[in-house]
Amino acid sequence: GSTVPPMVNVTCSEVSEGNITVTCRASSFYPRNITLTWRQDGVSLSHNTQQWGDVLPDGNGTYQTWVATRIRQGEEQRFTCYMEHSGNHGTHPVPSGNSHHHHHHHH
């Protein structure tokens, strides 16, 4: 089938002990090969500080996956979710202020 770019959605959890869990979800993409990783100041976080979900079919002939990490409250601006899929790429910021989600469809 033809390439379908992912929808990327970044969310924050509630604060606990000065930390926030940020999750980056990619959905509705094809083919299934994708790079999804958290960056700090543009540098990829080490693997042992990130959690990845499996790349799973989402029932529409496309796929979904996620990656999460914990960051210190107040440092949200330093972090982005980096996505590469079928020759396209993008960086996705952690939402700031009262907004707790951000999504973008790649074309």
């Epitope: 960056r39 100041d41 543009g42 540098v43 990829s44 080490s46 500080t49 982005t80 996705h92 910021p93």
Partner: antibody, heavy 118, light 108 residues
Amino acid sequence: EIQLVQSGAEVKKPGASVKVSCKPSGYAFTSNNIYWVRQAPGQGLEWIGYIDPYIGRIIYNQQFKDRATLTVDKSTSTAYLELSSLRSEDTAVYYCSRSGERSNFDYWGQGTLVTVSS
Amino acid sequence: EIVLTQSPATLSLSPGERATLSCSASSSISSNYLHWYQQKPGQAPRLLIYRTSNLASGIPARFSGSGSGTDFTLTISSLEPEDFAVYYCQQGGSLPLTFGQGTKVEIK
């Protein structure tokens, strides 16, 4: 081959502004941050700030926040540093660098000497 | 701000000798955020070691890095003529990003 090519040397008077350009090649321009660092003659390295060319996010060293402006032109894949209200202590070599997969500065430009003198 | 203090300021050694350079941080740094750069006169710095102990691409195996917490070390097992340069440590854990003041390795 990844390269970052910077604009040529500049001589400026105190109070003036300078704009230094940095044109990377050999990779997708918007996939990595562009950092700026300066080095006064005979001195160490000082981080100025960085810009994410994809989303335009800029993080400054607070010491430079009031006088430095980082921008990118995605149409020409070029990054810029503008420094205003120049003083003699701004005389330095200004470097651009690319954020790496595992380190902050993995490739560097050749440097641009900015001399501030009356 | 995390201050990185490098010692010694200058190291005078002969080719073939072992060089040990220290970088001490004012606050603890995760080993993932400590990097080393080499700079020769008139040139831009180049990445030497990333994340405390990993050699950057094209860097010979005589270079090694170690350390944790506040104390980090760069070792050159046997100095070659091209290794005489200034070496900087750098931390990326906290803003502002900071560099040590450098250690100059010069020919004795």
